[in-house]
Interface confidence: low
Amino acid sequence: MMTGTIETTGNISAEKGGSIILQCHLSSTTAQVTQVNWEQQDQLLAICNADLGWHISPSFKDRVAPGPGLGLTLQSLTVNDTGEYFCIYHTYPDGTYTGRIFLEVLESSVAEHGARFQIP
């Protein structure tokens, strides 16, 4: 039975040219995280494998950085980066958990950053 829940940064906004952290946290389960995939719509951005470490998709390697933790940092943001991002936690024995984050990249210099992600 899957008892875990994914907490995410939710809906966030950032300024064009800036950077933002996408972060998810899996709680309420003792399942082992074997791999985390970060995807944008249907494109794979990065993988963090428990044994092999990080792999960044070649098409994103100049603008995506691993971390903090299992999170992902997007740099040099463009308006085209606006959209849905998914963290997909592959766990054993529970299976797969998915979290969703919506990022809006704003032209304005008064972009409001979403609430900082805090683990209680």
């Epitope: 950032a14 971390g67 903090p68």
Partner: antibody, heavy 119, light 110 residues
Framework: EVQLLESGGGLVQPGGSLRLSCATS????????MSWVRQAPGKGLEWVSG???????YYADSVKGRFTISRDNSKNTLYLQMNSLRAEDTAVYYC?????????????WGQGTTVTVSS | QSGLTQPPSASGTPGQRVTISCSGD????????VSWYQQLPGTAPKLLIY???QRPSGVPDRFSGSKSATSASLAISGLQSEDEADYHC???????????FGGGTKLTVL
Amino acid sequence: EVQLLESGGGLVQPGGSLRLSCATSGFTFSSYWMSWVRQAPGKGLEWVSGIHISDSTYYADSVKGRFTISRDNSKNTLYLQMNSLRAEDTAVYYCAKGHTVLQYGMDVWGQGTTVTVSS
Amino acid sequence: QSGLTQPPSASGTPGQRVTISCSGDISNTRNNYVSWYQQLPGTAPKLLIYGNHQRPSGVPDRFSGSKSATSASLAISGLQSEDEADYHCGTWDNTLNAWVFGGGTKLTVL
């Protein structure tokens, strides 16, 4: 050559405040995660706080609500504002530069500045 | 704040191989890279191993790191007197959203 130089340490009474600075050179300061790490006399390393390139901040439970990390990219300087200081905050405070990949650790350390909290 | 567990001390004679362990749990060592730091007496820490097993330039290949599940190890072969120092392991903890260090291991060269 990458250099980190801490300053601002000293003797302060319990409940007092101090502001530590870390002047950096030799690398693109704004592109790296930076941390403060402390070491109490005769003890191991304790990570205090870190600031990401996106300006997201992270703190050890022991200093949350009392310490504030910040950075001034125009001055290539990292800061740690320490309020409500306690005797257990007595330590050498090191400024540390993160590796390009945050999870790879801290690849350059300053020489440290000593903070003593005592009445 | 929970951290990583290291033995407080280790020792060896010149030329010997010594190993220092660092154990954690699923939220830190299991899913993240471990780094190792050497701290010579009276000096600041220095990065010795990053990414579990990679050496920065200038670090002798006598130093090697490895990781298996939630435990990491630092091995020093051909022990030399100048290796006498404190050794600290560290990693990012996904639950705490914080860096954590081990308590440090004091290595004595007999």
